[in-house]
């Protein structure tokens, strides 16, 4: 089943994926689309990147994080209620069959009406963010997205990258989980 | 320490061509992207494109294709900007810069004049 | 293409005074890939800040950057006479890649 992201009007919605590049000089193409993973590709791009860059996108849809490095989160600004759904990211490992793909539910609730200021979440991720290697744990807790032959040190810089950033405070308010194996 | 070493200025007739270098230095040439950019006097920069000298692989602004041709000689560290049918739009100053753009060539002058 | 627009194009700041340069982007781009650079007549650009905010080898810490998605700014905490140049910011993660027409920072 896919994994559940939430977000309100008007907000930025964030859609996380992550794989581990083999070479700096080597990326593999990523491809965003709205709607499940079909066998191949990904249906209705948002978003592409190639060897080196984000070769298509459409506005309000982008990569905030170091795609360089293996982040390839999609962000999506200024939600609304038709943003609702399932989106497919799609690690286009070479090779035949060897593509990862990720299915993830954007799920956008209305705005809230808020009597008084309150700290705004500009993104927000319903359910806990969980790292897994390939292959281990059940498929709804693979929410980061393909890390093929990640090693413990890898993990774990990723999880100090992960309280260091932006998102510390959210991901600290949603219980963000680093699960190994 | 990291350098990037361009030719000097080039005072060419209209309708030539050109081949601007750039030689690097202090770091493993195959390795890392060259961008080129372009500078028009008083104006702001334009990339051109980069090659990755591992590959030969090349990316151009669309603005570019047909005006510029990358190249690289990996034997001597050499990155190589090939600029046809010149006209005075091309008269400009070229950076070569590095990777991630955290180095820049010096800069090479081309005035297109009759 | 992406357009990165800056603003203001020209502006003079007295010594000791607060400066913000913005450089605005017509969709969103990698706050990894968005950079500053600092430019003086007959010289080559100099990367100023790197990754929206990391200065530099050698900038001085009066100068930070910050921002996101597409809206990214620069700031000069007290301009001081050296900090006269034409400042640029640049996106390299969107193809092909991008430069703001500038900004001419003059002293008073």
């Known amino acids: 089943s896919e994994v559940e992201y939430r977000a309100e009007v008007g907000q930025n919605a964030y859609l996380p994926c992550f794989y581990t590049p083999a070479a700096p000089g080597n990326l593999v193409p990523v491809c965003w689309g709205k709607g499940a993973c079909p066998v191949f590709e990904c249906g209705n791009v948002v978003l592409r990147t190639d060897e080196r860059d984000v070769n298509y996108w459409t506005s309000r849809y982008w990569l905030n994080g170091d795609f360089r490095k293996g982040d390839v989160s999609l962000t999506i600004e200024n939600v609304t209620l038709a943003d609702s759904g399932i989106y497919c990211c799609r690690i286009q490992i070479p090779g035949i069959m060897n593509d990862e793909k990720f299915n993830l539910k954007l799920v956008i609730k209305p705005a809230k009406v808020t009597p008084a200021p309150t700290r705004q979440r500009d993104f927000t991720a319903a359910f806990p963010r969980m790292l897994t290697t390939r292959g281990h744990g059940p498929a709804e807790t693979q929410t980061l997205g393909s890390l093929p032959d990640i090693n413990l040190t890898q993990i774990s810089t990723l999880a100090n990258e992960l309280r260091d950033s932006r998102l510390a405070n959210d991901l600290r308010d949603s219980g963000a989980t680093i699960r190994i194996g | 320490q990291i350098q990037l070493q361009q030719s000097g200025p080039e005072l060419v007739t209209p309708g030539t061509s050109v081949k601007i270098s750039c030689k690097a230095s202090g770091y493993t040439f195959t390795d890392y992207y060259i961008n080129w950019v372009k500078q028009r006097p008083g104006q702001g920069l334009e990339w051109i494109g980069w090659i990755y000298p591992g590959s030969g692989n090349t990316k151009y602004n669309e603005k570019f294709k047909g005006k510029a041709t990358l190249t690289v000689d990996t034997s001597s560290s050499i990155a190589y900007m090939h600029l046809s049918s010149l006209t005075s739009e091309d008269s400009a100053v070229y950076f070569c810069?590095?990777?991630?753009?955290?180095?820049w060539g010096q800069g090479t002058t081309l005035t297109v004049s009759s | 293409q992406i357009v990165l627009t800056q603003s203001p194009a020209i502006m003079s700041a007295s010594p000791g005074e607060k400066v913000t340069l913005t450089c605005s982007a017509s969709?969103?781009?990698?706050?990894?890939?968005l950079y500053w650079y600092q430019q003086k007549p007959g010289s080559s650009p100099k990367l100023w800040i790197y990754?929206?905010?990391n200065l530099a080898s050698g900038v001085p810490a009066r100068f930070s950057g910050s921002g996101s998605g597409t809206s990214y700014s620069l700031t000069i905490s007290n301009m001081e006479t050296e900090d006269a140049a034409s400042y640029f910011c640049?996106?390299?993660?969107?193809?092909?890649?991008?430069f703001g027409g500038g900004t001419k920072l003059e002293i008073k």
């Open positions: 810069a590095g990777d991630r753009f955290d180095y």
């Open positions: 990754s929206t905010s």
């Open positions: 969709s969103g781009v990698s706050s990894s890939y």
């Open positions: 640049h996106q390299w993660s969107n193809s092909p890649y991008t």
